[in-house]
């Protein structure tokens, strides 16, 4: 079953390569277990950036080596992606799945265009 997912159209990463955005889903029921996946689309290729499954009311737990962190509040997920460089500029799509209890619902956002600008190197000082 389809579910609406909203996310910002554009986000500019910080000079330290950190980008944050909110992914909000219109839950048709009271899910207890939710999975959030961030997908990156660039040059018609879609790759999974990170994913987390969480129990409602608990923190999102990404893998230890994940570049993502996040928190949840109601039907909102606050996602932060770290370690971004200019080459990582692209469309980041939020996919939300309500896993349990049934029925299974899937929602895919339109994507957030994240722009990353590598910082200029500091000039050498004598």
């Amino acid at each position: 079953k389809a579910m609406h997912v909203a996310q910002p159209a554009v986000v500019l990463a910080s000079s330290r390569g950190i980008a944050s955005f909110v992914c909000e889903y219109a839950s048709p029921g009271k899910a207890t277990e939710v999975r959030v996946t961030v997908l990156r689309q660039a040059d018609s290729q879609v790759t999974e950036v990170c994913a987390a499954t969480y129990m409602m009311g608990n923190e999102l737990t990404f893998l230890d080596d994940s570049i993502c962190t996040g928190t949840s509040s109601g039907n909102q997920v606050n996602l932060t992606i770290q370690g971004l460089r200019a080459m990582d500029t692209g469309l980041y799509i939020c996919k939300v799945e309500l896993m349990y209890p049934p029925p299974y619902y899937l929602g895919i956002g339109n994507g957030t265009q994240i722009y990353v600008i590598d910082p200029e190197p500091c000039p050498d000082s004598d």
Epitope: K30, E33, P102
Partner: antibody, heavy 119, light 111 residues
């Protein structure tokens, strides 16, 4: 008609891996709400849910087997796969694939694949 | 994990008998008016067959002598008039919470 056809019986050594296939016909693995689940049954025992793959491509596993199992699907051939690694004798079982509804009940089953793990 | 306990583990009955199998869950499997509890029949050497889903809905093609009832933690599968082809093992299954779990089975044998 709607059916799932599984690959043939396998005999494996402890520590090795096995990959079982399940070809769907009469329905699409891309249909909304559809998932393919894998369930096993040891000789003379009950049923154990292994995990499932959703039409979205997401997978979900039983924590008791998560570290050793990988479920994949090739939508172009309507085939789902279940790979189990680091096999041990207690993995000897009939492995079934089944179509899962959005409510996670299993309304169509494959014929089963016997996997025997023996040295 | 949600544990499902079936009783009895086995029973002997005759053709025409009314048979009742119970399934008790370790916690409620109800959500928004639906009980996520299903029943399957399995014959030796064959895959399980779905009989009842969502506690009381009869799967298409399943004879009306099979019925399911219950909510919360206590569920029942009833065969109103046992037929020769009904001798098999019956399993309940919950899908309310991961991992999906099954009862240990109830074997219905000929008396």
């Amino acid at each position: 008609q709607v059916q799932l056809v599984q690959s043939g019986a396998e005999v494996k050594k402890p520590g090795s891996s096995v990959k079982v296939s399940c070809k769907a016909s009469g329905f699409s693995l891309s249909t909304g709400g559809v998932a393919v689940a894998w369930i096993r049954q040891a000789p003379g025992q009950g049923l154990e849910w292994i995990g499932q793959i959703y039409y979205s491509g997401s997978t979900y596993y039983n924590p008791s087997l998560k570290s050793r199992v990988t479920i994949t699907a090739d939508k172009s051939t309507s085939t789902a796969y279940m790979e189990l690694s680091s096999l041990r004798s207690e993995d000897t079982a009939v492995y079934y694939c089944a179509r899962s509804s959005a409510h996670y009940y299993f309304d169509v089953w494959g014929q089963g694949t016997l996997v025997t793990v023996s040295s | 994990d949600i544990q499902l306990t079936q009783s009895p583990s086995s029973l002997s009955a005759s053709v025409g008998d009314r048979v009742t199998i119970t399934c008790r869950a370790s916690e409620s499997v109800d959500f928004q008016g639906i009980s996520f509890l299903d029943w399957y029949q399995q014959k030796p050497g064959k895959a399980p067959k779905l009989l009842i889903y969502d506690a009381s809905s009869l799967e298409s093609g399943v004879p009306s002598r099979f019925s399911g009832s219950g909510s919360g933690t206590d569920f029942t599968l009833t065969i109103s008039s046992l037929q020769p082809e009904d001798f098999a093992t019956y399993y309940c299954q919950q899908s309310y919470r991961s991992p999906i779990t099954f009862g240990q089975g109830t074997k219905v044998e000929i008396k």
